[in-house]
């Protein structure tokens, strides 16, 4: 079965710094999403080879991509405290497949010592339950489509 390898599990960075999240699969995708989880999940990007990436307005100008949709590294720049959260990759194949999540902790520089990542991956219990038809070792949110809310339409 298709899987999404996502790394890192957790990262602590100061305000203004950058973070890399990598989503790797065995191929055969239609595209991949990075979504910030929460009561109101928010799509951050949609990436599909050969198509202009879709980026949510909040991250416009702060996102870079390297690699391909099968092995994608997403770099989020100039992080703000409000960017703290769990981000998950969603690979679109014939089913939905999810990464294990990356907990990004953005801290004020002087308080970094108080907020550190443990070695454990983000707890699945903190994430919403998956749709019944999804293939998943990892529970997350369901399928998505490109073109951001309140963001300019991209081809």
């Amino acid at each position: 079965a298709q899987e999404v390898q996502q790394s890192p599990h957790c990262t602590t960075v100061p305000v203004g710094a950058s973070v890399n999240i990598t989503c790797s699969t065995s191929g055969g995708l239609r595209g991949i999403y990075l979504r910030q989880l929460g009561p109101q999940p928010q799509d951050i990007i949609y990436y599909e080879d050969g198509v202009v990436p879709t980026t949510d307005r909040r991250f416009r100008g702060r996102i870079d991509f390297s690699g391909s949709q099968d092995n994608l590294t997403i770099t989020m720049h100039r992080l703000q405290l409000s960017d703290t959260g769990t981000y998950t990759c969603q690979a679109i194949t014939e089913v939905n497949v999810y990464g294990s999540g990356t907990l990004v902790l953005v801290t004020e520089e002087q308080s970094q010592g108080w907020h550190r990542c443990s070695d454990a991956p983000p707890r699945a219990s903190a994430l919403p339950a998956p749709p019944t038809g999804s293939a998943l070792p990892d529970p997350q949110t369901a399928s998505a489509l490109p073109d951001p809310p309140a963001a300019s339409a991209l081809p």
């Epitope: 951050i44 014939e94 038809g133 997350q140 369901a142 399928s143």
Partner: antibody
């Protein structure tokens, strides 16, 4: 049992507006993308718009700039705001659950929108 | 946009007959094809997704096959309750597009 119930259809004059609603029950609404599909009288199916669980939206060229799809996860509701309506928008509008980005596995009963002077 | 061409547009067959409906895409769609059934005056229902996977509750007389640009829906033994219009739909690329439909009637 998953259920989708549309409302808000009716008769409107060309250039007018309508807001369709779709109330969902029996599913974790916030976990699913949702779509609107329409069917003109005696015609086939036409995809109109979709919104992901995370809020990304997409529209058919025929409605882009006139229709807006949105959702309220707290109310388990999907919406379609339709502005600048034309006679060719006359159709039954269905909301559908989008299981895997285009795999529309549950449909509502539909609501009829008639655009006529 | 990907165009979906369905044939025939209508057919009439006897109960127990094997019925085949074809759908052709204007470009390869990598098996991202669904089939829907719409009975007269009713809501469309998903029959088959991803070319050949039977949706839950759908009778096994329905099957799907195909690859690349050409896809087929087969009803192995037509039943009176199968009178309906059948639509194919590609979901390889946005915008999602449907075939024009095939109306199936009983002789």
């Amino acid at each position: 049992e998953v259920q989708l119930v549309e409302s808000g259809g009716g008769l409107v004059k060309p250039g007018g507006s309508l807001r369709l609603s779709c109330a969902a029950s029996g599913l974790t609404f916030s976990s699913y993308a949702m779509s609107w599909v329409r069917q003109a009288p005696g015609k086939g199916l036409e995809w109109v718009a979709s919104i992901s669980s995370g809020g990304f939206t997409y529209y058919a060229d025929s409605v882009k700039g006139r229709f807006t799809i949105s959702r309220d996860n707290a109310k388990n509701s999907l919406y379609l705001q339709m502005n600048s309506l034309r006679a060719e928008d006359t159709a039954v509008y269905y909301c559908a659950r989008d299981e895997v980005r285009g795999y529309l596995d549950v449909w509502g009963q539909g609501t009829l929108v008639t655009v006529s002077s | 946009d990907i165009q979906m061409t369905q044939s025939p547009s209508s057919l009439s067959a006897s109960v127990g007959d094997r019925v085949t409906i074809t759908c052709s895409a204007s470009q390869g769609i990598s098996n991202y094809l669904n089939w829907y059934q719409q009975k007269p005056g009713k809501v469309p229902k998903l029959l088959i997704y991803y070319t050949s996977s039977l949706h839950s509750g759908v009778p096994s007389r329905f099957s799907g096959s195909g690859s690349g640009t050409d896809y087929t829906l087969t009803i192995s033994s037509l039943q009176p309750e199968d009178v309906a219009t059948y639509y194919c739909q590609q979901y390889s690329k946005l915008p999602y597009t449907f075939g024009g439909g095939t109306k199936v009637e009983i002789k």
